[in-house]
């Protein structure tokens, strides 16, 4: 596969004010329940050593983890935002299903593994933190994949 095969999202995904608002409101609701403000999941350490052209693939990994291991277990919380945001993020995940990179993805896997381990170590509060950073996930997908 050539580098960054199909690692692309249409800008129109991010031009729907309603779902943008719902995603950010969900993040706000969860962040109000997050009392561990020193830890940042989607921040400088996640992108360290990863070139911009590979960051869409990185964010695909984070998106899939967030959907499967965070939003699914917490799906009954933070309504009505959750029931609207999950299908939207699932659609983005489906659009990135063919996103792969060729070459060394060691840094990406290491950074994603660190994020996953942090969430797991924090338990339910880690899941709440990840939901509280959905605004960052959204912006990072927009920045990296459009």
């Amino acid at each position: 596969l050539p580098v960054n095969t199909r690692c692309k999202l249409e800008v129109s995904n991010f031009q729907q004010p309603y779902i943008v608002n719902r995603t950010f409101m969900l993040a706000k609701e969860a962040s109000l329940a997050d009392n561990n403000t020193d830890v940042r999941l989607i921040g400088e350490k996640l992108f360290r050593g990863v070139s911009a052209k590979d960051q869409c693939y990185l964010m695909k990994q984070v998106l899939n983890f967030t959907l499967e291991d965070v939003l699914l277990p917490q799906s009954d919380r933070f309504q009505p935002y959750m029931q609207e945001v999950v299908p939207f993020l699932t659609k983005l995940s489906n659009q990135l299903s063919s996103c792969h990179i060729s070459g060394d993805d060691q840094n990406i896997q290491k950074n994603v593994r660190r994020l996953k381990e942090t969430v797991k170590k924090l338990g339910e509060s880690g899941e709440i933190k990840a939901i509280g950073e959905l605004d960052l996930l959204f912006m990072s997908l927009r920045n990296a994949c459009v």
């Epitope: 403000t37 990863v50 052209k53 960051q55 509280g132 920045n143």
Partner: antibody, heavy 121, light 111 residues
């Protein structure tokens, strides 16, 4: 060492146009989102426009939308701001600014020294 | 255009702690994790001192700290020093993907 050098400022009449440039060096230019921020004499900072690493997303302040266009040429390590239909209130020092870390252009960690734009009849 | 509100001036004596607030509507500071703070000395370019709400760039003194509660972000300067006399600006990404700056706060070190 990260360096950002703006150019293209000058005096222009209301309704006129200018094209600002920002030459970047000391880092991998296409790994970072970039911004233009302005500061009118004696006033505060005002974000003007931002662009992601590949030019796929371009965002503007409401005050310049439809008049200004941001662009970048990664092969030339350069950022641009095309300013049309200029008004007196666009008079300011225009800074080029880079995101502090790759992946977050909104944290502006590196700034140029600015280029002065004066709109006057 | 969204607006972030800062006090126009804050003063303190050397060694004291001061806090600068930055208040926005729920669509600004309150909704997002994107708050940053900048220091600008007269005639100089702005300098990033806090990003991602509470993170400090390398080389920035640990006397500067950031926090956020509800719709208000805060910058605290502890052990105030003469060289801290400067203008300080908060900024945040907002829901139309633009960045909004606060109006700025002039910090004066007394005595």
């Amino acid at each position: 060492e990260v360096q950002l050098v703006e150019s293209g400022g000058g005096v222009v009449r209301p309704g006129g146009s200018l094209r600002l440039s920002c030459a970047a060096s000391g880092f991998t230019f296409d790994d970072y989102g970039m911004n233009w921020v302005r500061q009118a004499p004696g006033k505060g900072l005002e974000w003007v426009s931002g662009v992601n690493w590949n030019g796929g997303t371009r965002d503007y302040a409401a005050s310049v939308k439809g008049r200004f266009t941001i662009s970048r040429d990664n092969a030339k390590n350069s950022l641009y701001l095309q300013m049309n239909s200029l008004r007196a209130e666009d008079t300011a020092l225009y800074y080029c600014a880079r995101g502090w870390y790759s992946g977050a252009a909104w944290n502006m960690g590196y700034w140029g020294r600015g280029t002065l734009v004066t709109v006057s009849s | 255009q969204a607006v972030l509100t800062q006090p126009s001036s804050v003063s303190g004596s050397p060694g004291q702690s001061i806090t600068i607030s930055c208040t926005g509507a729920s669509g600004d500071v309150g909704a997002y994790n994107f708050v940053s703070w900048y220091q600008q000395h007269p005639g100089k370019t702005p300098k990033l001192i806090i990003y991602d709400v509470n993170k400090r760039p390398s080389g920035v003194s640990n006397r500067f700290s950031g926090s956020k509660s509800g719709n208000t972000a805060s910058l605290t300067i502890s052990g105030l020093q003469a060289e801290d006399e400067s203008d300080y600006y908060c900024a945040s990404l907002v829901s139309d993907f633009s960045v909004v700056f606060g109006g700025g706060t002039k910090v004066t070190v007394l005595g």
